[in-house]
């Protein structure tokens, strides 16, 4: 039987909580890596690709060594919400052109959503301040051409890959300090 009614829940082990978040992040990072390889193989595009609506790379938010857990989780959640929105937009806007990347894009979207829910849970379990609901973001304009959509796909997956690497490195580093 569980604890008697009214007794406080056992406080979670922060290292274990953080660890399971890292594992989900690494899984998503590997999915993103594989999808990026596929995209480069099927739709080669040289050079850096940017999309103004994507979040600024989190790594510019300060040196990893100086970051604290609340700021990493808050920033990561905000950025991943933006990437989720961009992946959804990509699938809607480019469905037919990128059909060779389905079901992988769908899986990526599902796992991104799962990681976001995991981050929300972690923040509440660690009693970190909850973010206010996100204001509705302006709709993303459809790509001007198929090529524009492919370049957007490169930018979205490339940015997500780097963001997840930043997250894995930051979270594992923070775990060593707990």
């Amino acid at each position: 039987p569980g604890p008697p009614p009214g007794s406080p829940r056992a406080s979670p082990d922060p290292r274990a909580e953080l660890d399971s978040t890292v594992l989900l992040t690494r899984s998503l990072l590997e999915d993103t890596r594989q999808l990026t390889i596929q995209l480069k193989d099927k739709f080669p595009a040289d050079g850096d690709h940017n999309l103004d609506s994507l979040p600024t790379l989190a790594m510019s938010a300060g040196a990893l060594g100086a970051l604290q857990l609340p700021s990493v989780l808050t920033r990561l959640r905000a950025d991943l919400l933006s990437y989720l929105r961009h992946v959804q937009w990509l699938r809607r806007a480019m469905g037919s052109s990128l059909k060779t990347l389905e079901p992988e894009l769908g899986t990526l979207q599902t796992r991104l959503d799962r990681l976001l829910r995991r981050l929300q849970l972690l923040m509440s379990r660690l009693a970190l301040p909850q973010l206010p609901p996100d204001p509705p973001a302006p709709p993303l304009a459809p790509p001007s051409s198929t090529w524009g959509g492919i370049r957007a796909a490169h930018a979205i997956l490339g940015g997500l890959h780097l963001t997840l690497d930043w997250a894995v490195r930051g979270l594992l580093l923070l775990k060593t300090r707990l």
């Epitope: 594992l23 899984s27 300060g62 990893l64």
Partner: antibody, heavy 119, light 111 residues
Framework: EVQLVQSGAEVKKPGASVKISCKAS????????MDWVKQAPGQRLEWIGD????????IYNQKFTGRATLTVDKSASTAYMELSSLRSEDTAVYYC????????????WGQGTTVTVSS | DIVLTQSPASLALSPGERATLSCRAS??????????IHWYQQKPGQAPRLLIY???NLDSGVPARFSGSGSGTDFTLTISSLEEEDFATYYC?????????FGQGTKLEIK
């Protein structure tokens, strides 16, 4: 051809600093992390730390925090490792290695730079 | 830190024989479908060379006679039929947590 080319051997006195360079070519420098590994005679390989060339600063093995400094020059596709307050135990071969994002496995290595610390 | 212990410390075999090298971790390095163990080969005076990543994935250009297996705390590198150029020192490495650490190595020698 993907390669990492490191600077030449160094002989230093105890207390001095050394800065090793690692020039990357044949791939997009910012697509991978750059890691540094120490191999002292008769000892295990030891991970010193890594840096993502996109920014955000390096992370270090606690054993090297405060003495190792990792930097990159993105425009020159070159990574650097500086080790300060050298002591005899720092005598080793130091390698730069290309690290897969988020996974810390190293698929391309520099040829190694021998650092000898001796008075 | 996670400690990796390799066995045997040295192994003497003949070309054509099968080599089995072991790596044991002080705690599990596997989780949610991934095992964070990697294998390298190093010859005297050379840098290490990645052979296997994430326990069982062959790096590009590595001959198919090399294979990796295992999960949890116990991992194996197998060389199905030894060639002259395979005689070297082999290291396992984990990347489950920070810092990544390496085993002490297994030296494979010609009998």
């Amino acid at each position: 051809e993907v390669q990492l080319v490191q600077s030449g051997a160094e002989v230093k006195k105890p207390g001095a600093s050394v800065k090793i360079s690692c020039k990357a070519s044949g791939y997009t420098f910012t697509d991978y992390n750059m890691d540094w590994v120490k191999q002292a005679p008769g000892q295990r390989l030891e991970w010193i730390g890594d840096i993502n060339p996109h920014g955000g600063g390096p992370i270090y093995n606690q054993k090297f925090t405060g003495r190792a400094t990792l930097t990159v020059d993105k425009s020159a596709s070159t990574a650097y490792m500086e080790l300060s307050s050298l002591r005899s135990e720092d005598t080793a071969v130091y390698y730069c290695a290309r690290g897969e994002l988020g996974h810390w496995y190293f698929d391309v290595w520099g040829q190694g730079t021998t650092v000898t610390v001796s008075s | 830190d996670i400690v990796l212990t390799q066995s045997p410390a040295s192994l003497a075999l003949s070309p054509g024989e099968r080599a089995t090298l072991s790596c044991r971790a002080s705690k599990s390095v596997s989780t949610s479908g991934y095992s964070y163990i990697h294998w390298y080969q190093q010859k005297p005076g050379q840098a290490p060379r990645l052979l296997i990543y994430l326990a069982s994935n062959l790096d590009s250009g590595v001959p198919a006679r090399f294979s990796g297996s295992g999960s949890g705390t116990d991992f194996t590198l197998t060389i199905s039929s030894l060639e002259e150029e395979d005689f070297a020192t082999y290291y396992c490495q984990h990347s489950r947590d920070l810092p990544p650490t390496f085993g002490q190595g297994t030296k494979l020698e010609i009998k």
